[in-house]
C-alpha cells in the first residue's frame, strides 16, 4: 500500500506527523502564541517532546541562524516553576540548560548557546523569533 505523507502549509516543514513553522519575526511570547493559533489546525507554539524532535528542529533552524533564541510553547503560567506545554502535551522530556530559572522568567526559549538543543527561561515580554507546530 502507498501511504501518503500529509502536506504542510507552504514553507512549513514536516517531521513525524507534525508541521513546524519557524517565524523570523519578533514577538513576545503571548503574541507569538496568538500568531501560531491564527493558522488554525490546532497550531500552537511548539512542544518538543523528545531528543529526536529537538535535534530535527535544531538542525533546521541552524540552517538559518545560530545566535537568536526562539520561543517555544513551554511556560509557567502560575509563576511557580510548574512548567507546561501550551498545546496540552505531557511535560516529560526536559532539556533545560544549566542557567538559573529564577527572576521574572516564565516562558521558555530554545537557546542558541547549545545549537538550539537546550532551553532557557526568559521574560515573556521579550520580543524574539518563534516556532509554531500543528498536526496536519
Amino acid at each position: 500500500d502507498i501511504i501518503m505523507r500529509p502536506s504542510c502549509a507552504p514553507g512549513w516543514f514536516y517531521h513525524k506527523s507534525n508541521c513546524y513553522g519557524y517565524f523570523r519575526k519578533l514577538r513576545n511570547w503571548s503574541d507569538a502564541e496568538l500568531e501560531c493559533q491564527s493558522y488554525g489546525n490546532g497550531a500552537h507554539l511548539a512542544s518538543i517532546l523528545s531528543l529526536k524532535e529537538a535535534s530535527t528542529i535544531a538542525e533546521y533552524i541552524s540552517g538559518y541562524q545560530r545566535s537568536q533564541p526562539i520561543w517555544i510553547g513551554l511556560h509557567d503560567p502560575q509563576k511557580r516553576q510548574q512548567w507546561q506545554w501550551i498545546d496540552g502535551a505531557m511535560y516529560l522530556y526536559r532539556s533545560w540548560s544549566g542557567k538559573s530559572m529564577g527572576g521574572n522568567k516564565h516562558c521558555a526559549e530554545m537557546s542558541s548557546n547549545n545549537n538550539f538543543l537546550t532551553w532557557s527561561s526568559n521574560e515573556c515580554n521579550k520580543r524574539q523569533h518563534f516556532l509554531c507546530k500543528y498536526r496536519p
Partner: antibody, heavy 125, light 109 residues
C-alpha cells in the same frame, strides 16, 4: 540630518574594476548595517550586498559573489563596494542604503529607510 | 523563491488601490515584508516596514498587510493622490540575502 552620498561611478570596460564609496553623516555609522542596492536602466531594484555595523559579517547576491567586495571604515563613516570583473549586466545606478533592523542578529535583515541619491556605473566597450 | 508583483495598476484620484506581492515558495508569513515607493527620477522611499508598520512621515493612507492563505503581502493606498504615482517594490528575505519584487507601476489617472 541623516545623509548618504555615493561616489565613484563612471564608465568602465567589461572585465574592468571600479570602486564605489558612500559617505554617511547624521547618525552613529558603526551602529548600523549597510546595504548596496542597484537599479539597471528601466528595471527594478536588486539587492547587491550588505555588511554588519562592525564589518565582521558580509552578504552578497549570487550575481556578484566572488566579484564584488563590500567593506566599511567606521573611523571615516564610509561604506565601500569594490567591483571587479565587471560585466555589461552590472550597468546600473548603485544606491547606498541603511535603516533600522527587525532582528539585530541578522545583518541582512534590515529595512532601508535612508537611501543615497545613487551613482551610475556603466560597463561598456 | 520570487516575489511577483503586477506590472502596472491604474486608479483615479480619491480611490483606494491595493498592490499585491506574492511569494512563489516558502511562507510569506515567516519573514518581514517591506514596501518602497520610487517616484520617477528619485531614490526609493520606505513606506511600510515589518509587514504593517509605517515610518514617521508616511501618511496613514498607506497600510500593509499579510495574507498567509494567498501567500501574499499587500500595500493599500486610500484617498489616492497624484503624488502617489510611481513604482512600488515589495521586499523580504531569503537566507542571507534580501529579495525585491519586480515592482508595480502605479498610475493615478
Amino acid at each position: 540630518e541623516v545623509q548618504l552620498l555615493e561616489s565613484g561611478g563612471g564608465l568602465v570596460q567589461p572585465g574592468g574594476s571600479l570602486g564605489l564609496s558612500c559617505a554617511a553623516s547624521g547618525f552613529t555609522f558603526s551602529s548600523y548595517a549597510m546595504s548596496w542596492v542597484r537599479q539597471a536602466p528601466g528595471k527594478g531594484l536588486e539587492w547587491v550586498s550588505a555588511i554588519s555595523g562592525s564589518g565582521g559579517s558580509t552578504y552578497y547576491a549570487d550575481s556578484v559573489k566572488g566579484r564584488f567586495t563590500i567593506s566599511r571604515d567606521n573611523s571615516k563613516n564610509t561604506l565601500y563596494l569594490q567591483m571587479n570583473s565587471l560585466r555589461a549586466e552590472d550597468t546600473a545606478v548603485y544606491y547606498c542604503a541603511t535603516g533600522g533592523s527587525g532582528s539585530p542578529v541578522y545583518y541582512y535583515y534590515h529595512y532601508l529607510d535612508v537611501w543615497g541619491r545613487g551613482t551610475l556605473v556603466t560597463v561598456s566597450s | 523563491f520570487m516575489l511577483t508583483q503586477p506590472h502596472s495598476v491604474s486608479e483615479s484620484p480619491g480611490k483606494t488601490v491595493t498592490l499585491s506581492c506574492t511569494r512563489s515558495s516558502g511562507s510569506i508569513s515567516f519573514d518581514y515584508v517591506q514596501w518602497y515607493q520610487q517616484r520617477p527620477g528619485s531614490s526609493p522611499i520606505l513606506v511600510i516596514f515589518e509587514d504593517d508598520q509605517r515610518p514617521s512621515g508616511v501618511p496613514d493612507r498607506f497600510s500593509g498587510s499579510i495574507d498567509s492563505t494567498s501567500n501574499s503581502a499587500s500595500l493599500t493606498i486610500s484617498g489616492l493622490q497624484s503624488e502617489d504615482e510611481g513604482d512600488y517594490y515589495c521586499q523580504t528575505y531569503d537566507d542571507n540575502r534580501q529579495v525585491f519584487g519586480g515592482g508595480t507601476k502605479l498610475t493615478v489617472l
